[in-house]
Interface confidence: low
């Protein structure tokens, strides 16, 4: 025997209290597939969340984040605070990148500057909190008249040793 509820389209639910009649989803609820026995409550975009797409009888609301925040998680389940370039988000808020590290995004973590000498190259442009070092040609490739910027030696983390 065919389940009578299978005839209920999206936007309705199969109401067992009313002889399995297809009833429209109540306000602020939806069913995105047919044959549902209940409608789901619409997501509400509150606080730091803002509505990107309104809820309809057949689809849930979609949220994004207010300016200064960005989405994390499936379907923007969380909003994480943006930081400025040159900062990273910590439990205590946005903190400037430590010397020798940078972040060129509004999200993510500060990354160490490139060590140009690892590839036998010289530093063409010093790193900043917002930008990585730019490596140039190896010192041997520079003509006698050419000059290169030499940054101060980067601070070493405890436990680091040359390989």
């Amino acid at each position: 025997l065919q389940d009578p509820c299978s005839n209920c389209p999206a936007g309705t639910f199969c109401d067992n209290n009313r002889n399995q009649i297809c009833s429209p989803c109540p306000p602020n609820s939806f069913s995105s597939a047919g044959g549902q026995r209940t409608c789901d409550i619409c997501r509400q975009c509150k606080g730091v969340f803002r509505t990107r797409k309104e809820c309809s009888s057949t689809s849930n609301a979609e949220c994004d984040c207010t300016p200064g925040f960005h989405c994390l998680g499936a379907g923007c389940s969380m909003c994480e605070q943006d930081c400025k370039q040159g900062q990273e988000l910590t439990k205590k808020g946005c903190k400037d990148c430590c010397f020798g590290t940078f972040n060129d995004q509004k999200r993510g973590i500060c990354r160490p500057w490139t060590n140009c000498s690892l590839d036998g190259k010289s530093v063409l442009v010093n790193g900043t909190k917002e930008r990585d070092v730019v490596c140039g040609p190896s010192p041997a490739d520079l003509s006698p008249g050419a000059s290169s910027v030499t940054p101060p030696a980067p601070a070493r983390e405890p436990g680091h040793s040359p390989q």
Partner: antibody, heavy 116, light 111 residues
Amino acid sequence: SRSLVESGGGLVQPGGSLRLSCTASGFTISSYHMQWVRQAPGKCLEYIGTISSGGNVYYASSARGRFTISRPSSKNTVDLQMNSLRAEDTAVYYCARDSGYSDPMWGQGTLVTVSS
Amino acid sequence: DVVMTQSPSSVSASVGDRVTITCQASQNIRTYLSWYQQKPGKAPKLLIYAAANLASGVPSRFSGSGSGTDFTLTISDLEPGDAATYYCQSTYLGTDYVGGAFGCGTKVEIK
């Protein structure tokens, strides 16, 4: 939509060379650290190297000398040039957006087979 | 190069169990560590970045902790879909050495 697609894989003889390309859609590749990783059949993931957003390159010691990572300025790609290939270089090669960011991305991989 | 040592190499657990995987770095990598899940024939999927941050779309059953040289991935309330191989990766590209290395994986099987 945003994606990474590797290309250039295939069969190559021992001692030969191959250039793999990774093309980005939906974002600018030069804004991110990009890495190449490989995986031999049934083996662990192996890091090859990274090109930073500033254009600087790091290599694993096992890749230094034979492999070169570059980012052609005219294209939204990152390339992996592989020379003096050996049978043990047979693997699936992946490019990936560095996972230090909260929105990572990996390509589907391209198979390189080194065999005579 | 930094060397990542992962353990155990495999673990068999039941649905609903808590599984803990550890990863040890040969040198101090602060919190520059990521955890990946890989299923056969698929590219790795990022679970955790910066040692303890949940990547986009990853269930909160997965959690990461640690800093310096010792790191842990915990899967609580194990589900059948969690059967996979899990890898740690150093993402520290330091002034003294190249990071990037992966551990050699932990295969999680469901009993």
